[in-house]
């Protein structure tokens, strides 16, 4: 029995519903009474959902899963996973047994977009060219971990003196804080780009600093 699932991971946004597709080719005369369908976590073999003895046996996974009962007889064994969480990410195995049997694993990739970065400056007043300032770019509640890039007003990447930290909250979503230490020119724009590598989503923040003009002591 050939069991088919998508080769590419299924990408689902946190809080939305995802469909893990799985199909098989029933032989002529196939009846649902013969079907034993198991969805389980690939690594731990924890039961997620099952269909046995001609009946949907329900969700064993936080009551957030459902089959498509009207489509089972046509060989559609797909699983609906509701209100996706970060903890759901991973591989799910679809196992189908009739007379023959087969299985295949589908990957679920969870994602959440990052918020528009907020920019803070320290110190934030009486700045002069030559001063060293700390610019912090903060973006919240994204998944998976972000990639952070800094550049100046001319689009030149700034890679030195950057410290980035990412902390997961209780839902597994990341808050990212990236700190750039820079010596001010006469004036300048500093941009931070927070990229979600799964969604290919870029969130931009920028700050423009106008330095006070340099004052020199009068010549003797």
């Amino acid at each position: 029995l050939e069991v088919q699932v998508p080769e590419d991971p299924v990408v689902a946004l946190v809080g939305t519903d995802a469909t893990l597709c799985c199909s098989f080719s029933p032989e002529p005369g196939f009846s649902l009474a013969q079907l034993n369908l198991i969805w389980q976590l690939t690594d731990t073999k924890q039961l997620v959902h099952s269909f046995a003895e001609g009946q949907d046996q329900g969700s064993a996974y936080a009551n957030r899963t459902a089959l498509f009962p009207d489509l089972l007889a046509q060989g559609n064994a797909s699983l609906r996973l509701q209100r996706v969480r970060v903890a759901d990410e991973g591989s799910f195995t679809c196992f189908v047994s009739i007379r023959d049997f087969g299985s295949a694993a589908v990957s679920l990739q969870v994602a959440a977009p990052y918020s528009k970065p907020s920019m803070t400056l320290e110190p934030n007043k009486d700045l002069r060219p030559g001063d060293t300032v700390t610019i912090t770019c903060s973006s919240y509640r994204g998944y998976p971990e972000a990639e952070v890039f800094w550049q100046d007003g001319q689009g030149v990447p700034l890679t030195g003196n950057v410290t980035t930290s990412q902390m997961a909250n209780e839902q597994g979503l990341f808050d990212v804080h990236s700190v750039l230490r820079v010596v001010l020119g006469a004036n300048g724009t500093y941009s931070c780009l927070v990229r979600n590598p799964v969604l290919q989503q870029d969130a931009h923040g920028s700050v423009t600093i106008t330095g006070q003009p340099m004052t020199f002591p009068p010549e003797a």
Epitope: V3, Q40, K45, E53, T93, F95, I98, R99, D100, F101
Partner: antibody
Framework: EVQQVESGGDLVKPGGSLKLSCAAS????????MSWVRQTPDKRLEWVAT????????YYPDSLKGRFTISRDNAKNTLYLQMRSLKSEDTAMYYC??????????WGQGTSVTVSS | DIQMTQSPASLSVSVGETVTITCRAS??????LAWYQQKQGKSPQLLVY???TLPEGVPSRFSGSGSGTQFSLKINSLQPEDFGRYYC??????????FGGGTNLEIK
Amino acid sequence: EVQQVESGGDLVKPGGSLKLSCAASGFTFSSYGMSWVRQTPDKRLEWVATINSGGSNTYYPDSLKGRFTISRDNAKNTLYLQMRSLKSEDTAMYYCARHDGGAMDYWGQGTSVTVSS
Amino acid sequence: DIQMTQSPASLSVSVGETVTITCRASESIYSYLAWYQQKQGKSPQLLVYNTKTLPEGVPSRFSGSGSGTQFSLKINSLQPEDFGRYYCQHHYGTPPWTFGGGTNLEIK
């Protein structure tokens, strides 16, 4: 008449390898999942490996994964079990069995494997 | 993995008597249970599958019952050819489809 004839069992030293065969006849071999099951000297039955009809899925107990490989040649109506790094606890009678779902509806007569120095 | 516990390990009975062998699964296997009979020097033979379905050729004195985690095989009016070993095996879900430890049924 459904028939499965196992062969390839032998006396082998620990660490050695052996390949068992099961020649099937009397049914459409390519339509059925097949398993190897062994019976230890104390008469316990132990599931060893399973393969589905097309050979796309194979299943093993964690304890044997990596050492044993099940395969099939549907053109030759033959099931195989490659056993490597054999241990004394692999000593058993090895049966091939045909599946109807998870239940095994026909078994061969078995082939004996003894692992001893 | 699902564990199968079979009892008794052995029993000695007379021809004509009725015997019951039980099998317990460590978690629900619904009705996906098979029983096998093995006579001395022979390979196992399927006796019952899906708890109570008898393959063609199996005498009606054999009957299976149960569901979930508790199952039994009953043999009415034992015949001389019924003596041997009996094994239960679950066939629910993905392998391993484990076997019980076996019951040796001998003539008293």
